[in-house]
């Protein structure tokens, strides 16, 4: 492998390792981590793309774990708080074996090649240009870390346009009890928009490393229902909306609506009386055709907590429930920025909303 580009490689660095990425991450930068997984001692290793050396702000945490059959966790840490995990349940690494791990930085995501095959796509939750450090720790021996710069560095677009494709996989939530809202999680990469966390906890400390709209505060331990809030900037590819809450023990139905003016662009309607999750669009008070298919059993359970992650991509919304990708809903209203209102109602208690 030729070590091209402006930065010299780190050769046989000792682990744990932290090193500067000269000039920070750039669109098109390719970083190769070559090494061997240790056959003894420890069940995990991690490669982190972070801001500074403290480990409190990690834009991309890539964490293979030789546990429970083997899986890889991807995550982001902001101000010391981890976001929801994305898990890949195939393990491309083998204990005692060498590996070649290549990270390709692109405007919308990191693409990770392991031993010559695309392994995972991780969409930026924080602007990647903040990253100036790579760190490696855990049960691994490194041969080198190399850097290959692109020939030209395009300006990062205001909006990410590459669709999200990797199924979301958070860790499963413990069932049967209320969950604390997750810590601060992803700020969106688009610089002209803001992420707003609507919280019912006591006032938090500084939530963002850059100025942001302060979170909406509620004096009660639960959200008012129905809950309605603005989605600043509307939808666009890579925009995420996260909700968590608890289904009431006697629940019949609840709904999560993404609205555009008088239209409901996306109506997510779990129905316990029908054991179904109905999806639809309402235009001018007229409902379209329902979508009900699910890849597995009804994920919402009366009396139990849940999380819903809605991720907008160019062609569709991807919806994950309790960390597992559930379905895609292809846009019927395609003017995404006009879809700028979230409405939640029905037989649930909300504990956390982030738009």
């Amino acid at each position: 492998m030729a070590f091209s580009g402006s930065q010299a490689p780190y050769l046989s660095p000792a682990v744990p390792f932290s090193g500067t990425i000269q000039g920070g991450l750039q669109d098109g930068l390719q970083i190769t981590v070559n090494g061997t997984v240790l056959s003894s001692s420890g069940t995990r290793f991690a490669v982190n793309f972070q801001t500074g050396f403290s480990g409190n702000d990690i834009a991309f945490h890539f964490n293979p774990r030789f546990e429970d059959g083997g899986y890889v966790v991807c995550n982001t840490r902001q101000n010391g708080s981890w976001g929801p995990e994305e898990r890949k349940t195939h393990m491309p690494f083998q204990k005692g074996m060498p590996f070649d791990l290549c990270f390709l930085v692109q405007s919308s995501d990191f693409k990770v090649m392991v031993n010559g095959i695309l392994f995972v796509q991780y969409f930026h939750r924080v602007p990647f240009h903040r990253v100036d450090t790579i760190s490696v720790n855990g049960s691994v021996q490194l041969s080198y870390i190399s850097f290959q710069n692109p020939r030209t560095v395009p300006v990062q677009p205001a909006f990410s346009t590459v669709p999200f494709s990797q199924p979301v996989c958070f860790p499963p939530r413990p069932r049967g009890r209320r969950q604390k809202p997750p810590g601060v999680w992803p700020a969106n990469p688009a610089p002209i928009t803001q992420t707003v966390i609507h919280t019912v906890q006591s006032a938090p400390g500084q939530m963002f490393s850059t100025p942001a709209i302060p979170p909406m505060m509620y004096p009660h331990p639960a959200y008012p229902m129905p809950f309605i809030t603005t989605i600043l900037g509307g939808l666009y590819p890579s925009k995420s909306i996260l909700l968590s809450g608890t289904v009431l023990p006697s629940a019949q139905r609840f709904h999560i609506n993404l609205c555009s003016g008088n239209h409901i662009a996306f109506h997510l309607n779990p129905r316990f009386d029908e054991n179904a999750v109905v999806r639809n669009t309402q235009i001018d008070n007229s409902w379209g055709s329902e979508e009900r298919s699910l890849p597995r059993k009804m994920p919402f359970v009366r009396g139990q907590s849940f999380s819903v992650w809605i991720l907008c991509e160019a062609h569709c919304l991807k919806v994950a429930v309790d960390g597992q990708h559930l379905f895609e809903y292809y846009h019927r209203l395609r003017n995404l920025p006009t879809i700028n209102r979230l409405e939640v109602g029905g037989d649930i208690q909300l504990t956390h909303v982030q738009t």
Partner: antibody, heavy 126, light 109 residues
């Protein structure tokens, strides 16, 4: 000019062995992954195995796991497919192909098999 | 394993026709999908990589697109040399990192 040339095919009895070679020129096998793909007579393409010589990583289709072994000799710029315990259903034309080279001009991975050999026929029959 | 369901299995078309072939992945494969053309007795040739990028030297009448887990190969105006079998292929790491579609034979009407 990039080129891949397979050799080693032929007629073999069930339970027998063959070793296929894939000689590369115009690029180094250690900079790409090398795949074997087969095609039974009148059928579609079936992926068999791959090796990433740079790290030594190998992977196999379930249908050949435990019977076939892929390897590479970077000094000879050649990849190999050792086929043991051959069965009638292994009868096919075997191709080697190069996969996933990085295009620095476009900052893109070429997620596809951009160069293929001409193929070598393996016939398993008694 | 990730399955690639290709349709149709065969089609008849005339020179100048617009031809569309579709592959549906059984789960997300990102954009790591390629399309190949194969003629009898010959090795496959790469047409499209990364779902929509035209490979060097391939005529511009070939194009690829993606919508979720659906991938499409389009030949805008079929030429005599385009009568062949076409395969899609995914390469997104799974228990089997590479899988091909069943193939689509494009024949002369």
């Amino acid at each position: 000019e990039v080129q891949l040339v397979e050799s080693g095919g032929g007629l073999v009895q069930p339970g027998g062995s063959l070793r296929l070679s894939c000689a590369a020129s115009g690029f180094t096998v250690s900079s790409s992954s090398i795949h074997w793909v087969r095609q039974a007579p009148g059928k579609g393409l079936e992926w068999v195995a791959y090796i990433y010589p740079y790290s030594g990583y190998t992977s196999y289709a379930d249908s050949v796991k435990g019977r076939f072994t892929i390897s590479a000799d970077t000094s000879k710029n050649t990849a190999y497919l050792q086929m043991n315990s051959l069965r009638a259903e292994d009868t096919a034309v075997y191709y080697c192909a190069r996969y996933s080279t990085y295009s620095s001009s476009s900052s893109k991975w070429v997620w596809g098999m951009d160069y293929w050999g001409q193929g070598t026929l393996v016939t398993v029959s008694s | 394993d990730i399955q690639m369901t290709q349709s149709p299995s065969s089609l008849s078309a005339s020179v100048g026709d617009r031809v569309t072939i579709t592959c549906r992945a059984s789960q997300s494969v990102s954009s790591a999908v390629a399309w190949y053309q194969q003629k009898p007795g010959k090795a496959p040739k790469l047409l499209i990589y990364s779902a929509s990028s035209l490979y060097s030297g391939v005529p511009s009448r070939f194009s690829g697109s993606r919508s979720g887990t659906d991938f499409t190969l389009t030949i805008s105006s079929l030429q005599p040399e385009d009568f062949a079998t076409y395969y899609c292929q995914q390469s997104y790491y799974d228990s089997n990192p590479i899988t091909f579609g069943q193939g689509t034979k494009v024949e002369i009407k």
